[in-house]
Amino acid sequence: FERTRSLQDPCSNCPAGTFCDNNRNQICSPCPPNSFSSAGGQRTCDICRQCKGVFRTRKECSSTSNAECDCTPGFHCLGAGCSMCEQDCKQGQELTKKGCKDCCFGTFNDQKRGICRPWTNCSLDGKSVLVNGTKERDVVCGPSPADLSPGASSVTPPAPAREPGHSPQ
């Protein structure tokens, strides 16, 4: 079948990195600069992806493979093949259309991306708060009072005072 196909279609003999040039009697011509063909038998080469601005080049384009981009520091990749770059925030913040904003009281974010999430409610598991939460860290739940040995006491630190200027977004 392969032999039959190549007799019928000379383009099938063109390897990756070339294209079947109709203007030159279907001769296999190398892909022009800034273009590539990743499979054989192609009638055109694809334009290389350009990594500029918010994108930077992770892998250069070659005649047989497209360029690969990642994001300039300060931003991180989103989507398949890093199709978008999204701004980093500090821990204790989340990204909004107004830029990076501090987590509201009672929420935290321990990463440079993603949203602020509510602190764990220790009492739902019958436990007490061992370490208070912050904008950057979740609370740490301790053992429930019932788990404590007789005579021991559970010291629950007071809840932190509401910080000024951290009204809900």
Epitope: G53, V54, F75, L78, G79, S83, M84, C85, E86, Q87, L95, T96, K97
Partner: nanobody, 123 residues
């Protein structure tokens, strides 16, 4: 081909003004949120401002509030950044960038940006 081309950068004295422009081609500007971001020498990329499709929403990083104004002319497929009261710390390469499909709903990712225009603030 989808393209953004910035212009208008240059050397300006502290306290001076500049207006950056960004010409969009290959897509309809009025369908997208648009952004300006900048990269100071030796620093990471910093988001500066954004504007929604019809220009009714505009947001700025704290350090430029009251000094920079983002605007757009959808009929001319152009985005602008008016910069006044410029400071040495505004020295950077400025890029315009398109908010990707779903910007402001699912994410705040930028999917297209230009080559940038250089702004130098120095006496």
């Amino acid at each position: 081909e989808v393209q953004l081309v910035e212009s208008g950068g240059g050397l300006v004295q502290p306290g001076g003004s500049l207006r950056l422009s960004c010409a969009a081609s290959g897509f309809t500007l009025s369908n997208y949120w648009m952004n300006w971001v900048r990269q100071a020498p030796g620093k990471g990329l910093e988001w500066v401002a954004n504007i929604n499709q019809d220009g009714s929403e505009r947001y700025y990083v704290d350090s430029v509030k009251g000094r920079f104004t983002i605007s757009r002319d959808n009929a001319k497929n152009s985005l602008y950044l008016q910069m006044s009261s410029l400071r040495a710390e505004d020295t950077a390469v400025y890029f315009c960038a398109r908010g990707g499909e779903g910007y402001g709903v699912d994410h705040y990712g930028l999917d297209v940006s230009g080559q940038g225009t250089t702004v130098t603030v120095s006496s």
